[in-house]
């Protein structure tokens, strides 16, 4: 027991997605070891020579770090002793997508696990009543998506109805020429009904709900990442 390298330790990663232009997290946990100085964390990326990040002897060691990750990575140093080897990634780019390996060595042994990291853009939709239209309509807007998503409308009253004939969806390229703004308008809506605007690509699914009554408008939005988990 306790001879480094002789035993395997459990390392767990979670498939995750990064939103380009924002912070991302590559999730990795391992069996804790109270001896911080004995813990080595190495992050590697398939197809990249050099390391994404290395943490050892209680501090970062960037001597072998690949240039594309310079100044963009950090572990949560205060959480390493409790078994958190997750990596914070600054300014996620499309090119950060790929297969990563989280390799751990402690006084108890060593282990590693792979994770698939997807990158794209996803954002919460906002639905508003469009009073400018000739008939009452709803406007669903989401500022940043990539790859191009699908957009579908649904209604609580007319469950199963196909709204493609009474809606119009457009995709407008944003200033950085990668992500797009999604705008979808649903026409001929009726009051005392709840409508949902669903935006989905292979990374995320977002839903915006709006309930329109005579006296008020209620909104709710949610976003879920797809295929995230161990």
């Amino acid at each position: 027991f306790g001879i480094s390298g002789k035993h395997f330790i459990t390392v767990t990663t979670f498939t995750s997605a990064g939103n380009i232009g924002e912070d991302g997290t590559l999730s990795c946990t391992f069996e804790p070891d109270i001896k911080l100085n004995g813990i080595v964390i190495q992050w590697l990326k398939e197809g990249i020579k050099g390391l994404v990040h290395e943490f050892k002897e209680g501090k970062d060691d960037l001597s072998q770090q690949h240039e594309m990750f310079r100044g963009r990575t950090a572990v949560f140093a205060d959480q390493v002793v409790v078994g958190n080897a997750s990596l914070r990634l600054k300014n996620v780019q499309l090119t950060d997508a790929g297969t990563y390996t989280c390799y751990i060595r402690t006084s108890k042994g060593k282990g590693n696990a792979n994770l698939e990291y997807k990158t794209g853009a996803f954002s919460m939709p906002e639905i508003n009543v469009d009073y400018n239209a000739s008939s009452e309509s709803l406007r669903c807007e989401a500022p940043r998506w990539f790859p191009q998503p699908t957009v579908a409308w649904a209604s609580q009253v007319d469950q199963g109805a196909n709204f493609s004939e009474v809606s119009n969806t457009s995709f407008e390229l944003n200033s950085e020429n990668v992500t797009m703004k999604v705008v979808s308008v649903l026409y001929n809506v009726t009051i005392n009904n709840t409508y949902s605007c669903m935006i989905e690509n292979d990374i995320a699914k977002a839903t915006g709900d709006i309930k329109v009554t005579d006296s008020e408008v209620k909104r709710r939005s949610q976003l879920q990442l797809l295929n995230s988990g161990p």
Epitope: I20, G21, E22, D60, G71, A74, K90, N91, E176
Partner: antibody, heavy 121, light 107 residues
């Protein structure tokens, strides 16, 4: 408590060089990037460049490339800014600042008191 | 390189006023915009980073927002100690860049 203490004011002649120091304490010096920013009299802030003391990696503003060198001495937890071929427009207060986020290059969260460099014939 | 265009360059306001300062990035998208306050003869002080995260110890009357190329610093109710010069900083790319600054003066 994070502290950055800079060297004293300097008066230099045009064409000369100046080296400003920034001694860090209160945190692990090799784990955080240190940046340099200058401010000419009555003007705004201008980013010069930064260094990761743990490996000596540097980034420079294109405007200063070839004239500026940022170095560090890990044994004394000190970062240095050297600016050569000085001209009158280089007269400014030079600040060092620690970047938040350890090896992740964040925003500048702790600043030195500033060093006035005057270039005059 | 990304340039940050800050406006206005100066403004006059009274105690209790709501003040808004904007910065526009020349290109790209990322959330790495910070805001600083600087008083005469002093080093800048970090107020907000990552577009909207308040630095510990900074009063909640300061807030940041923005997306795409447009970012905003708002002071909800100006206090006497808030009269100073404010700068935005873009720090998402390899090369950092400050805005030109906005001087907030007493009306």
């Amino acid at each position: 408590e994070v502290q950055l203490v800079q060297s004293g004011a300097e008066v230099k002649k045009p064409g000369a060089s100046v080296k400003v120091s920034c001694k860090a304490s209160g945190y692990t010096f090799t784990s955080y990037w240190i940046g340099w920013v200058r401010q000419a009299p009555g003007q705004g802030l201008e980013w010069i460049g930064d260094i990761y003391p743990g490996g000596g990696y540097t980034n420079y503003n294109e405007k200063f490339k070839g004239r500026v060198t940022i170095t560090r001495d890990t044994s004394t937890s000190t970062a240095y800014l050297e600016l050569s071929s000085l001209r009158s427009e280089d007269t400014a207060v030079y600040y060092c600042a620690r970047l938040d986020g350890s090896s992740y290059r964040g925003a500048m969260d702790s600043w030195g008191q500033g060093t006035l460099v005057t270039v005059s014939s | 390189d990304i340039q940050m265009t800050q406006s206005p360059s100066s403004l006059s306001a009274s105690v209790g006023d709501r003040v808004t300062i904007t910065c526009k990035a020349s290109q790209g998208f990322n959330k790495y915009v910070a805001w600083y306050q600087q008083k005469p003869g002093k080093a800048p002080k970090l107020l907000i980073y990552y577009t909207s995260t308040l630095q510990p110890g900074v009063p909640s009357r300061f807030s940041g927002s923005g997306s795409g190329r447009d970012y905003t610093l708002t002071i909800s109710s100006l206090q006497p100690e808030d009269f100073a010069t404010y700068y935005c900083l873009q720090y998402g790319n390899l090369l950092y860049a400050f805005g030109q600054g906005t001087k907030v003066e007493i009306k």
